[in-house]
């Protein structure tokens, strides 16, 4: 099925995290010679949606006017020329933040922590939930920084950070989510400030264990679990 | 209206091959997916294949798989079903339906043919 | 492989609501399933009624309706008529397959 044309963009907005009951506009874009447009949800029955170009032709809008956990998954889109249909663009993984209630962070012993030390982070669920994540706001790529383990449910999961160096200072917050779908997370916990004081002589992270890796375009959040951690902070269940 | 009306059943023995045609009117063949459906005598219902709007995927069930091929000719408005390999447990009869331009629009299997008997018997 | 199991039989009169239940072998039935309702009458007479778990095919009678009802999928009957005896059937989608379930026969006395 797939053609030699190239492959289309496909992005969301206002983000690819979207909160319950808001709207999000998927945006497929391919050429000019682009007669109409596909997009594919990873394991649907039938194509997720079907739209004509919109002028000049090498883009097509698709609309989701209340974000539900029918529309979180991944998304493919292809293009179809008088030649036939192209590659697939690149996945995007459309995330719905919302379907369970927050959990809570906290640290540990504080969050007032002396570069060098250590702290941990510390998510808390009421019910029992198999994946955690930790995002650190104004990161570059936020989704992508931690997940804990995949194990059996857990009430909370722990996230140490050793040893503390300023750049880990900033807002934290965390999620939880059930093995059966990472598209679907939690509302989000109330932010965590993590203030690192004495920073003289601040020790350089190593390239392994680097804070805020940049991911690129085709980095999407919410990788299977087992993925290297993008993130000094160590993923670990309690 | 929508209509659709297989052909092409039969008695056959076993280990032959047989193709049953769906024909299609009243829609815009071309635009949508399309399902295989069977029914044993006396049984419910068992699911065989669907094939997408373009031909370009195609999902069979664990039974049939190997054995069975869905394909459509959209200039014909028709779907076909290429039985190879039959067993005596091919025995039903068997139902095209119709599938959904997409997710966002449509409901899947809502219009149905009448059906066509196979027979697998020596 | 999934199985995908139903009532066999239910019973109920005219004026009634009446939900048939659609469970699924390998856990709860979840959108991704995209559970289908599809009812046969007499002399192999099939109409689809709810896909998507709770989207209607246009022109279905607007009491029956498809929801989630715990880990199952459910078609409800509001006020149940005459003319709904007959068998349903629910079908779920398990990433490259669709499995039927074997099917509620619907008496309406």
């Known amino acids: 099925q797939a053609g030699p044309l190239p492959k289309p963009t496909l992005w969301a907005e206002p983000g690819s995290v979207i909160s319950w009951g808001n709207s999000v506009t998927i945006w497929c874009q391919g050429t000019l010679e682009a007669r109409e447009y596909r997009l594919d949800k990873e394991e649907s029955p039938a194509p997720w949606d079907r739209q004509n170009p919109l002028e000049p032709k090498n883009k097509a809008r698709f609309s989701i006017p209340s974000m539900t956990e029918d529309y979180a998954g991944r998304y493919r889109c292809y293009y179809r020329s008088p030649v036939g249909w192209s590659q697939p663009s690149d996945p995007l993984e459309l995330v719905m933040t919302g379907a369970y209630s927050k959990p809570t962070l906290s640290a540990l012993p504080s969050p007032l922590v002396t570069s060098g030390k250590s702290v941990t982070l510390l998510c808390q669920s009421r019910s029992p939930m198999d994946t955690f994540l930790l995002i650190k706001e104004r990161a570059a790529h936020p989704l992508l920084h931690l997940r804990s383990e995949h194990g059996a449910q857990q009430h909370q999961a722990e996230f140490p950070m050793s040893p503390v160096t300023s750049v880990h200072g900033g807002t934290y917050r965390c999620f939880s989510s059930h093995g059966f779908s990472h598209y679907l997370l939690s509302h989000p916990s109330d932010p965590l400030e993590l203030i690192v004081s004495g920073s003289l002589e601040d020790p350089r992270p190593s390239p392994t264990r680097s804070v805020s890796t940049a991911a690129g375009p085709e980095d999407q959040p919410l990788m299977p679990t087992g993925s290297v951690p993008h993130s000094g902070l160590r993923r670990h269940w309690e | 209206q929508v209509q659709l009306v297989e052909s092409g059943g039969g008695v056959v023995q076993p280990g032959r091959s047989l193709r049953l045609s769906c024909a299609t009117s009243?829609?815009?063949?071309?635009?949508?997916?399309m399902h295989w459906v069977r029914q044993a005598p006396g049984k419910g219902l068992e699911w065989v294949a669907l094939?997408?709007?373009?031909?370009?995927?195609?999902y069979y069930a664990d039974s049939v798989k190997g054995r069975f091929t869905i394909s459509r000719d959209n200039s014909k408005n028709t779907l076909y079903l290429q039985l190879n390999s039959l067993r005596a447990e091919d025995t039903a009869v068997y139902f095209c339906?119709?599938?959904?331009?997409?997710?966002?629009?449509?409901?899947?299997?809502?219009?149905w043919g009448q059906g066509t008997l196979v027979t697998v018997s020596s | 492989d999934a199985v995908v199991t139903q009532e066999s039989a239910l019973t109920t009169s005219p004026g009634e609501t009446v939900t048939l239940t659609c469970r699924s072998s390998t856990g709860a039935v979840t959108t991704g399933n995209y559970a289908n309702w599809v009812q046969e009458k007499p002399d192999h007479l099939f109409t689809g009624l709810i896909g998507g778990i709770k989207n209607r095919v246009p022109g279905v009678p607007a009491r029956f309706s498809g929801s989630l009802i715990g880990d199952r999928a459910a078609l409800t009957i509001t006020g149940a008529q005459t003319e709904d005896e007959a068998i349903y059937f629910c079908?779920?989608?398990?990433?490259?397959?669709?499995?039927f379930g074997g099917g509620t026969k619907l008496t309406v006395l």
């Open positions: 079908a779920l989608w398990y990433s490259n397959h669709w499995v």
């Open positions: 094939i997408w709007f373009d031909g370009g995927n195609q």
């Open positions: 339906a119709r599938d959904v331009i997409s997710m966002v629009r449509g409901v899947p299997f809502d219009y």
């Open positions: 009243g829609f815009t063949f071309s635009s949508y997916g």
